[in-house]
Interface confidence: low
Amino acid sequence: PPEAVTIDEITDTTAQLSWRPGPDNHSPITMYVIQARTPFSVGWQAVSTVPELIDGKTFTATVVGLNPWVEYEFRTVAANVIGIGEPSRPSEKRRTEEALPEVTPANVSGGGGSKSELVITWETVPEELQNGRGFGYVVAFRPYGKMIWMLTVLASADASRYVFRNESVHPFSPFEVKVGVFNNKGEGPFSPTTVVYSAEEEPTKPPASIFARSLSATDIEVFWASPLEKNRGRIQGYEVKYWRHEDKEENARKIRTVGNQTSTKITNLKGSVLYHLAVKAYNSAGTGPSSATVNVTTRKPPPSQPPGNIIWNSSDSKIILNWDQVKALDNESEVKGYKVLYRWNRQSSTSVIETNKTSVELSLPFDEDYIIEIKPFSDGGDGSSSEQIRIPKISNAYARGS
């Protein structure tokens, strides 16, 4: 390999290098390639040089296109007709000179926040592109259509957010925003101007006409209407708060809808329980006033007893199933009927037949094994399932089992 590279001179974007050739293994060196490494690069990377192609008799080159105020080390690799040799030992580490920053923050945007706030956000400029010490940002903003920019200097390279808080900021009003950069060398460019909206005012009126109904022992459906009066805050959706009668309101659970949906289903509730519900409109500024509270009691839980004593027999291409009636307990919803679920052994999707009797006749081909289960249903929902019954593939026309 060539002997270690020496850095003879370094500027903000260039480095003058020299090296001494190593042994050529009896095949003349035809070219050298310069590689560089920084704390920010993944391993060694080839770099641009002047001259662009370094022949085997040239032992100096200028590396160009470096980033200012970044620590570099360099090495050289020799090549001949046989192939590429071992790289030289790295040079010492040297930092390029400082320069004015040239890269502006990406994705300047913002919005949201609390009342009377303008929130401005951006992606920070990576350290290797800051071009010097003392890096920071200049945030410029003005109400849309106004002449004068307001400026704030943020003396921190990590800054990615600025909040302007002032009573004069009207809710959800547009501002022109741009973010510039600076370092110890001076000011760099600004990002392109973008429009960011100040924080909204939360909705000022409650939803109207709240109505709730129990769907089962575990589910409630809630309905409401948009606020009747003119609402100052934009509505992004609604928040439904619900809590059990024996609980405190502060322990309530909340679910949110998005958009202009004016109903929602609340699931995973307990049976025979009185629930209180209230609805609020919300937006990015917060929630508005609460509607009046409405009450709803979930239905009694479904029967806990599964159908028992299931007997089946088959004739022709029919399977006839019989089972014992399920009796609901006092605190359970009465049985309205039964669901018979069946599927082929090899098939994942299940078919369902509903009946209000304690027997059912299934017309099924006999060239498959069947898996069958039965469960009662009620106003409170589906009850407990029987154990799965496997009815084997039947070759003869008559069979029975239990």
Partner: antibody
Framework: EVQLLESGGGLVQPGGSLRLSCAAS????????MFWVRQAPGKGLEWVAE????????WYAPAVKGRFTISRDNSKNTLYLQMNSLRAEDTAVYYC????????????????WGQGTLVTVSS | ELTQDPAVSVALGQTVRITCSGS???YGWYQQKPGQAPVLVIY???NRPSGIPDRFSGSSSGNTASLTITGAQAEDEADYYC?????????FGGGTKLTVL
Amino acid sequence: EVQLLESGGGLVQPGGSLRLSCAASGFTFSSFNMFWVRQAPGKGLEWVAEISGGGGSTWYAPAVKGRFTISRDNSKNTLYLQMNSLRAEDTAVYYCAKSRDTWSYGAATIDAWGQGTLVTVSS
Amino acid sequence: ELTQDPAVSVALGQTVRITCSGSSGSYGWYQQKPGQAPVLVIYDNTNRPSGIPDRFSGSSSGNTASLTITGAQAEDEADYYCGGYDGSTDVFGGGTKLTVL
């Protein structure tokens, strides 16, 4: 190194007044929002008041609004808290504090605190 | 109002999570040892100031912020406060006393 040194605490009777001062050094004082935060004996932190870098905007906790006034003298690198109509529940250690960045405000971003000065309101 | 659990304990070297719920969009976390002023350990939900060990980390989801200490040390025993802005005023949580067992 940022340093904040409070003074002016002491014993005062209910209804009385007190003025706290906080001498700041080690940073560009006029660039940063400043705060007063208090802590009653054995209790948690309570934000009291805040003032913008230039002094043009002030914010107060509901419990002190109308009784306390936060101000600053950027030429002297000093923060003040004028406390009037003091009550027993104002008894606390009062900390002077600084926002983390020139653009930060609020109790989410205090990066430097003084050692505090004790205010006792008792008859 | 920001709500914190009053007390949490953790075995030495284990991970502990302290939560803070309220309406702040941006939370900070402070460590306070007896007789000392508080110290900022997390700002803007997830950022760690220089000098704070990397076992401290912050996260935020919805209206809840969390401070996680991964591999708690004896010196981490302290009161921890969250701070934020609730839409009308700056507030601190009631504090969580962390005991390292």
